[in-house]
Structures are given as C-alpha cells and as structure tokens.
C-alpha cells in the first residue's frame, strides 16, 4: 500500500492511474467503503462523506487515465486508507496528516524557551527533527522544546517528520524579541552631547509597550530612574523624565536618547527595559556612558575618566607628536610642570583610542587654553 | 492566504529566452498544479503550460517545442521559460494556482519582444 | 482544442440593469467552465467555478448556469466596480482555453 504523508492545512494530491489512458469510470472510497469522489461521464460526483465540500478531481487528466484524489485544508482526522476503483483496478493509499505548532506565540523574548507540538493521526509512530535558523539540530517525539532563545534563533526553523521512510517537512517563523545589542559603551568627552540608540533586532508591524531608563552613575550610592516612556504602534511619547538630567527622546524607532552634556556625575550604567503588550517579561540592555576630562591647574595637568572602564584600558597623557609622558591602567594621570603645548589626553584599548581630549598647555606666563 | 509574485526580464530582444519566476506565498504548494498563461495585447487569454510540485507538466501543443516550466519546491518557486521568441510573444504573462480553475493570479509581468 | 466563443464581444449597460454574457463550448465540457473577471493593469478574478459556482467573496449578483456546450452569466443588478472584460474558460480538457471575452462598458 501507498502511503501518502500530508501536513495540516495542506492541500494533497493522491493519484491514481488506470492501465487505459482514457476517460472512464472510477470512484475513490474511504476504509469505511464511504464514496467520496467519482465520475458519471464527464460529471464529477461527490459521495455523503465529511470530505465533501474539500474534494476535488482534475477533469483534465482523466482522459490520460488519471484519476486524482485532491483533499483541500486537510485536517489530521483526513489520516485514513483511501481506496481508488478504476475499471478492474483497485490501488490503495494511505493517508497519514501531520501537524506541528509552536506552544504559544511564535513571537518570543530572549531567554524564554520554545515548545514545538507534533499532532499526529493515532497508530503513527514519526519522529521529528528540526533546524534552527543558526544551524542547531534538535530531535524529538511529539513534543521538541529549546529552552534559552538567543537572537540568533529568529528566523525560520525547517522541521521534518519520518514516518515509513517517508518525510514532510515544515517551515515555522520564529521571531526573537530582543535589542540588536545586550550591551553598548559611549566614550564621550565633557560638555559633549551623549546620544544612546536601541535598535530592535526584529520587526512587527505595530508594536506596543512601555520602557524605562534607569541609570546608576559611579558617583552615586543608588540608581535612579531617569526616563520612562510609552510605546504606541512604533510611536514613542515620553511619559516622566528626571530634571537632572533632562533627556530627549525621539519620538520614532529605533528607541534613540540624547544626553545634552555629557558631565562627570552621568558617567555610569544604565538599563534601559522594554515591557511589550501581551508578553511576560521584558526586554533589556545595557548602557554604559564613561566621561573624559582634561584639566590644568597650577602646574599639575590631569587627565580623568569616569564611569565603567575595563582595567585593560590604558589612560595616557601625550605631547602631541611625542611619546607619551604618563601612561597607566588607571582612571586618572597627571603631569607636574607640563612644557608648553598641546596635549593630548588618551584612553585606549590594545593601542586603538577610544576617547581623546585635548588641551592647550601655554607658556608659564599665560592661563591655559582649552580648545 | 495564497499570494503569488512574480518577476522577470521586461524586454528582450528576437530569438532570445524568456525567462519569469512565480514565488508562492501562504498556503499549499504540495497538490495543486501553477500555471502559466500570457495575454498579448489588446486579444485573450492564452494558457501556457503548467506543473506540480513533483515537476509534472503539461503544456499547450502549440507552445510546447519552446516552453520549459520548472519547480523549486525548497523555495515554493515556478519558472516559465520561453525560447526563440519573436514580437508575437509580446503579452502580459500571469502566473496562476490551478485545480481546474485559475484562482489566485499573480500581478502579471508585461514582456516586450523588439529588436 | 477546445473552442470557446463568447457573446457579445461588447456590451453597453447601466448602473442596475442586467446583463446577460454567453459562452459556448466546440463541444460538450459538462460542467468544467469557469467565469473570470478581468479590469486592465490587474489580474483576472474568478467569479464563477463548475458553471454554477459562486467564488468565496465574489457578491450574490453574479450567476452562472449552463452545462454541456451552451453557458451564461448573469449579472442582476451592474454596479459601478463591474464594468470590465469577462472570459470564460473549460477546464474539460487539455489544453485549457479561453473565450475571446466580452467587455461590459458603461452606456
């Protein structure tokens, strides 16, 4: 016997050939011998089955002696052994309809797990293995879980079902709901304007929620919220914002924060969090802002940082086309009775310069220049 | 529910191959046939040809020395490709879902034969 | 082939009169025709299926009758959005064919 794999929802084409390559009389049947489909002439005939309005035949090929089965929007109580009557020829089919569904919303946060769900008709025995969009296999019966969603598991994951060395295949659409970045850095001098983006690593038509910016600066002995907002259909409307400092937002996507002077006292981490209609939980990341400044008193010029910097970060203070005079994994550097010039302050990771300020050291008898 | 794209060369000239793809959106590609059929300016609808998912063709006796349909099921694709065409294969070509009736059509590709 | 000849070739009406479009088949095709509504810049839409059929979506004031060789569509009351070029089609045999279609204008 034939058999015949079909997914849920699907159309299926089950063929029966007749050994005349002419137009003559058939009928398919179910196991229970129900009619189901036939011809009288060039009529096409539908029997009392449950099928009935999600049959069909293709008239055209009748004259080449095929006698086509076509169920519509199969359903996985369709599993069944269909039985085609041409002439003196009997051929059976069997029918065997697969479904496979994601546990709730194919739209899911970072972190949270998926749960795949195989229906199958009663008597099967199909295994099912399925890829995810970053090439991770994963096997399983009728049930495939992935617990800890990462970014890179959005997209589509191509999941087949093995049943009597016969395969079909299905294509689900996984959305990750995360920012593009977990974390970000800005490296900005002081009285410079800070602007903080959150791209979305995906994209849905409306989108609604609310977030929050709450930041911690290293000065501080606890964090403070410093902005909160809502989200309507991609539209951004601030709801609460702090009087120091006084963030903008930007009305639009992506999620984007402009600092208007970046000061000693912001330098710190913040986290900013999305809550998104009809999820749990919410979406995050984090920011860092780290702060520069270069000064001269008297005769002590001094270069400082503030904020989250790695202690591999090097903080020199140069001569501009000499060598550096000081140079320390340290937040703060000095020269004593610097030589006239200008200066160059630099924070830098493995030689490449991450932040740089510059300041005009003038002849003892003049006050100093900051360009 | 079912959507169909289709793209391909606006303009060609005698004696080249026509060549147009189908992309089917939502819904079944396995158990139904894609046909193709082209209307030449301002006269009828004229069927092509047409193919299954298992690559099972028919196609119209009159076209049928010039004409190749093929299916790439990984990408729930059709193509059309026609050869040798002269001015008379000037038309707005149209992709289609068949059973026995054509439901529903692509947005049709207008194809300029000239030299 | 299958010859399929439709009448008129033209047609003018009004906004809420009846129109009566015939097609006939070179030779008998039971009930394998469909109806087809066709407006120029888009693609054509079916009407009518199994000569008699109405097409999910497509308003009660299109019919179809007919079987053998002779086939009508009817359409009971024109509104605005009908105004177009209808063909009918066999799907009995291969190759499928066409009618050379009747354009319904506006009187």
């Known amino acids: 016997k034939k058999v015949v794999l079909g997914k849920k929802g699907d159309t299926v084409e089950l063929t029966c050939t007749a050994s005349q390559k002419k137009s003559i009389q058939f009928h398919w049947k179910n196991s229970n011998q129900t009619k189901i489909l036939g011809n009288q002439g060039s009529f096409l005939t539908k029997g009392p089955s449950k099928l009935n309005d999600r049959v069909d035949s293709r008239r055209s090929l009748w004259d080449q002696g095929n006698f086509t089965l076509i169920i519509k929007n199969l359903k996985i109580e369709d599993s069944d052994t269909y039985i085609c009557e041409v002439g003196d020829q009997k051929e059976e089919v069997q029918l065997l309809v697969f479904g496979l569904t994601a546990n709730s919303d194919t739209h899911l946060l970072q972190g949270q797990s998926l749960t795949l769900t195989l229906e199958s008709p009663p008597g099967s025995s199909p295994s099912v293995q399925c890829r995810s969009p970053r090439g991770k296999n994963i096997q399983g019966g009728k049930t495939l879980s992935v617990s800890q969603l990462e970014l890179q598991d959005s997209g589509t994951w191509t999941c087949t079902v093995l049943q009597n060395q016969k395969k079909v295949e299905f294509k689900i659409d996984i959305v990750v709901l995360a920012f593009q970045k977990a974390s970000s850095i800005v490296y900005k001098k002081e009285g410079e304007q800070v602007e903080f983006s959150f791209p979305l690593a995906f994209t849905v038509e409306k989108l609604t929620g609310s977030g929050e910016l709450w930041w911690q600066a290293e000065r501080a002995s606890s964090s403070k919220s410093w902005i909160t907002f809502d989200l309507k259909n991609k539209e951004v409307s601030v709801k609460r914002v702090t009087q120091d400092p006084k963030l903008q937002m930007g009305k639009k996507l992506p999620l984007h924060l402009t600092l208007p002077q970046a000061l000693p006292q912001y330098a710190g981490s913040g986290n900013l969090t999305l809550a998104l209609e009809a999820k749990t939980g919410k979406l995050h990341q984090e920011v860092n802002l780290v702060v520069m400044r270069a000064t001269q008193l008297q005769k002590n010029l001094t270069c400082e940082v503030w904020g989250p910097t790695s202690p591999k970060l090097m903080l020199s203070l140069k001569l501009e086309n000499k060598e550096a005079k000081v140079s320390k994994r340290e937040k703060a550097v000095w020269v004593l009775n610097p030589e006239a010039g200008m200066w160059q302050c630099l924070l830098s990771d493995s030689g490449q310069v991450l932040l740089e300020s510059n300041i005009k050291v003038l002849p003892t008898w003049s006050t100093p220049v900051q360009p | 529910q079912v959507q169909l794209q289709q793209w391909g060369a606006g303009l060609l000239k005698p004696s080249e191959t026509l060549s147009l793809t189908c992309a089917v959106y939502g819904g079944s590609f396995s158990g139904y046939y894609w046909s193709w059929i082209r209307q030449p300016p301002g006269k009828g609808l004229e069927w092509i040809g047409e193919i299954n998912h298992s690559g099972s063709t028919n196609y119209n006796p009159s076209l049928k020395s010039r004409v190749t349909i093929s299916v790439d099921t990984s990408k729930n694709q059709f193509s059309l490709k026609l050869s040798s065409v002269t001015a008379a294969d000037t038309a707005v070509y149209y992709c289609a879902r068949v059973i026995n009736w054509f439901d529903p059509w692509g947005q049709g590709t207008l194809v300029t034969v000239s030299s | 082939d299958i010859q399929m000849t439709q009448s008129p070739s033209s047609v003018s009406a009004s906004v809420g009169d009846r129109v009566t479009i015939t097609c006939r088949a070179s030779q008998d095709i039971s009930s394998w025709l469909a109806w087809y509504q066709h407006k120029p810049g888009k693609a054509p839409k079916l009407l009518i299926y199994?000569?008699?059929s109405l097409q999910s979506g497509v308003p009660s004031r299109f019919s179809g009758s007919g079987s053998g060789t002779d086939f009508t569509l009817t359409i009971s009351s024109l509104q605005p959005e009908d105004f177009a070029t209808y063909y009918c089609q066999q799907a009995n045999s291969f190759p499928y064919t066409f009618g050379q279609g009747t354009k319904l204008e506006i009187k």
């Open positions: 199994a000569a008699s």
